[in-house]
């Protein structure tokens, strides 16, 4: 059962797994919940009638029966992890905390002339897992405007105490907000010859790397695959790290892969969602129980429901017996990995998928596409809505991106002459224009947010946020695109699509099918040969054949160019201008998604 | 409710400066781009130049030598300055607000009557 | 700069009778965005100008339907199906597609 809310002056008694310190409860709630056994905590507040060294410890505790009996305690607050929710989960924490030192291992020392600063300082550095930063009111003089980067091995402080005139924080890696490389890359028969920091038992260099990306000190990884020839390390991944960031020594060993944490990739690839099954393969654990399955997909799903199993070993059933049914173990580990792997004995095993809403819904594989033709198929393109206008009469206005449960990404031009969000609904889920009844259900728009600097699509700035009245329930019909990461500017984007009911030459109609188009991205250099009177910013990405034939054109406009990169969807662009339409050597001009992920987060992580 | 006032001195003398000030009310001026829009007397409208929400300018280029357009947001204010007038600069001075976008100017003031005279 | 130029300078109109009025511009106005920014005032007399329509022919709430739009590229059409003595004024015509933005000369609607 999902519970949100802190028990205020009440301590679980008896379960502890570890102490961390946290700088809140409701951060302490969210640590439980990344930690692969926290069910329940109990944090210690600041409060005259506790010892000052108990002030803020998180105490992370597990319990076979998912509860503990209660105590009361002032200053005490308790709860439950957000594991046993179904909802979408992040370990995004912008908060800064006032007068809270919070100690780690100081290994950068800076000035900035702002917290924000030394915020942004710290997330964009590779070790920072927090900050402390000394105000211009700090007493002593040479401390003044002083910037700690600090990290520690378990990525939250060692101590937190009470300091006047010092602020903290965290990290925004988690938030997106980083502007370090996105390596996607695993180097085949590497070893990295690095500290270990880790170690854990993988059954691939995928589940590996991802494993990597949500250990707080892990930078890069090595692991040795079931064909290396040291038997005692098969199947290990090692999680390592050096003081620049980088792999000191890359070292040619055959059956190892090596590569990288995906920290600044992971709000636009699964980094928790290990969702593949793993064939005639046994993974080793404490047993949690044992039920009979029809199969292994039915496994995985026992061990996803049941809330303290972390992977899971099938057995399929011997011939006629059990009514055809296999046995399903339901298993867990200290730190959520199989003690032990072992092949040939002919178990399938896996990952519980609870893990999955920690990863952005985004990354949710849609189902197979058609190739070729320019019509689309139902549930293709399903961030893809159309935007209708009611005044004077009800028409399709521009195409949008669903990129939260609340926002619509569009352009700002398709705003022209729109005086109030009242006249406007976004259908999603739609294929044919001709779907849209007056019974059709749709989301009212409660405000539009363009960007300030819009002026004409020409000049660039051509994006708007549209912030719905309801939230959209995800469904294979209608979820979310993921904004391309950061980390990711020098990714080479080869299988693109523009999609929308707009006209299919200049002087047309809209159509009633979603129409959809591959179309090759043009470099911004190639793109501005073909626009002398303009000026091609790095903030337009521009698309199209040189002879022509296929583009997008009026109706299009706010829709998606959609890319796919390592089988995940990114919008990468948003349809804004062009010369004509299709015309030869005049590509398409699209707003650059990746230059505006910050204007996005700020607007749409608004309080 | 959304209202635009010009206000200023109806009287300007040829060479001196002409300086009006656009009061908004009902909205902040940030959010909306404020354009400047003349009218001589028994003639037809000339665009003069806009205040972008974000505080750029853009002038009308037959004006551009002449016209500054700024803006005051704790005031709620925009202001015109033409210099170097002439009696051809005699107009009525109306500013207006640009829609969610630019254009099209949805809200008006009631305008203001410059005389350009010694 | 772009030229809009609008026929008939004067337009005198029986009261329930139709009326048009044509702007014609030096270049095309149909931007590289997909609108088309021509929008049509109307100035009543010893008042400010009110818009009437955008993009050609889009209404702006609480304008009557008798005012509709038509027209592309550098031909623009104004049309009133059955013209009111409240519709009395000069109309001008105006883009915002290329800097600097212009208006028509106007057309002056009076009652016959």
């Known amino acids: 059962e999902c519970v949100t809310q802190l028990l205020k002056d009440t301590c679980f008694e008896g379960g502890d797994i570890t102490t961390v310190f946290t700088p809140s409860a409701k951060y302490c709630q969210v640590v439980c919940t990344y930690h692969p056994r926290c069910l329940l905590f109990t944090f210690t507040a600041e409060s005259p009638s506790e010892d000052p060294t108990r002030w803020f410890t998180c105490v992370l505790k597990d319990s076979v029966t998912e509860t503990l009996p209660r105590v009361n305690r002032t200053a005490a607050i308790s709860g439950y992890s957000f594991k046993q929710c179904s909802h979408q989960i992040s370990a995004c924490n912008k908060d800064i905390y006032v007068d809270l030192d919070m100690k780690g291992i100081n290994y950068n020392s800076s000035v900035a002339k702002s917290a924000q600063e030394c915020q942004e300082r710290c997330t964009d550095d590779v070790h920072c897992h927090f900050f402390t930063y000394a105000t211009r009111q700090f007493p002593s003089l040479e401390h003044r405007n002083i910037c700690l980067l600090k990290h520690t091995q378990t990525g939250t402080p060692t101590r937190i105490t009470k300091l006047d005139k010092v602020v903290s924080g965290f990290s925004l890696k988690s938030c997106a907000l980083s502007n370090l490389a996105c390596i996607r890359d695993i180097f085949p028969n590497t070893v990295f010859a690095d500290s270990n920091i880790d170690s854990v038992m993988a059954p691939d260099a995928f589940v590996c790397g991802r494993i990597c990306t949500h250990h707080p000190g892990c930078l890069f990884f090595t692991f040795f695959s079931q064909e290396w020839p040291k038997e005692s390390q098969r199947n290990l991944c090692l999680l390592k790290t050096s003081e620049s960031g980088l792999p000191s020594t890359r070292i040619k060993k055959s059956k190892a892969l090596s590569g990288f944490s995906l920290q600044s990739c992971r709000h636009s690839i699964p980094v928790f969602c290990h969702s593949s099954f793993y064939h005639d393969t046994d993974f080793l654990g404490e047993e949690l129980d044992i039920v009979a399955a029809k199969s292994h997909e039915a496994c995985q799903k026992l061990c996803t429901n049941a809330v303290r199993c972390q992977f899971f070993t099938y057995t399929p059933a011997q011939a006629s017996c059990n009514e055809g049914k296999g046995k399903c173990y339901l298993k867990l580990s200290s730190n959520g990995s199989p003690t032990k792997i072992l092949h040939g004995r002919g178990g399938i095993s896996g990952y519980t998928l609870r893990l999955c809403k920690m990863d952005n819904e985004c990354t949710t594989k849609i189902k197979p596409r058609i190739v070729g033709g320019t019509a689309s198929v139902r549930g293709e393109w399903p961030w893809q809505v159309t935007l209708h206008t009611t005044s004077p009469t009800q028409r399709h206005l521009c195409g949008g991106s669903i990129i939260g449960n609340q926002w619509i990404l569009t352009a700002a031009h398709c705003f022209y002459g729109v005086e109030s969000p009242k006249i406007l609904r976004v259908y999603s889920g739609i294929l044919n224009q001709s779907e849209i009844k007056e019974d059709t259900s749709f989301f009212g728009v409660q405000e539009i947010i363009i960007h300030d600097q819009y002026k004409m699509a020409e000049s660039g700035y051509d994006i708007a946020l549209l912030k719905l009245e309801t939230t959209v329930n995800y469904t294979d019909s209608q979820r979310p695109i993921c904004l391309p990461s950061k980390g990711d500017r020098n990714v080479i984007y080869t299988d693109c699509w523009v999609t929308g009911w707009g006209y299919r030459k200049l002087r047309d109609k809209i159509q009633n099918t979603l129409q959809k188009a591959k179309i090759p991205l043009v470099t911004n250099e190639e793109c501005q040969k073909r626009y002398r009177g303009h000026k091609i910013t790095h903030k337009m990405i521009c698309a199209g054949y040189r002879e022509g034939g296929k583009d997008a054109c009026k109706g299009d406009s706010g829709g998606p160019l959609s890319c796919k990169h390592n089988e995940v969807w990114h919008l990468v662009g948003i349809t804004s201008w062009g010369e004509g339409c299709a015309q030869r050597e005049r590509p398409g001009v699209y707003t650059n998604v990746v230059e505006y992920v910050d204007w996005i987060l700020e607007k749409t992580q608004a309080v | 409710q959304v209202q635009l006032q010009e206000s200023g001195p109806g009287l300007v003398k040829p060479s001196e400066t002409l300086s009006l000030t656009c009061t908004v009310s009902g909205y902040s001026i940030s959010t909306y781009h404020v354009h400047w829009v003349r009218q001589p007397p028994g003639k037809g409208l000339e665009w003069i130049g806009i205040?972008?929400?974000?505080?750029?300018?853009y002038y009308n280029p037959k004006l551009k030598s002449r016209v500054t357009i700024s803006v005051d947001t704790s005031k709620n204010q925009v202001s015109l300055k033409l210099s170097s007038v002439t009696a051809a600069d005699t107009a009525v001075y109306f500013c207006?607000?640009?829609?969610?976008?630019?254009?099209?100017?949805?809200?008006w003031g009631q305008g203001t009557l410059v005389t350009v005279s010694s | 700069d772009v030229v809009l130029t609008q026929t008939p300078l004067s337009l005198p109109v029986t009261p329930g009778e139709p009326a048009s009025i044509s702007c014609r511009s030096s270049?095309?106005?149909?931007?590289?965005?997909?609108?088309?920014?021509l929008e049509w005032y109307l100035q009543k007399p010893g008042q400010s100008p009110q818009v009437l329509l955008y993009g050609v022919s889009n209404r702006l709430s609480g304008v009557p339907d008798r005012f509709s739009g038509s027209g592309s590229g550098t031909d623009f059409t104004l049309k009133i199906s059955r013209v009111e003595a409240e519709d009395v004024g000069v109309y001008y015509c105006?883009?915002?597609?290329?800097?600097?933005?212009?208006f028509g000369q106007g057309t002056k609607l009076e009652i016959k």
């Open positions: 205040m972008w929400r974000d505080g750029d300018t």
């Open positions: 207006a607000r640009g829609g969610t976008l630019t254009t099209p100017f949805t809200y």
């Open positions: 105006f883009q915002a597609t290329h800097g600097p933005f212009t």
């Open positions: 270049q095309s106005l149909e931007s590289r965005d997909g609108n088309t920014y």
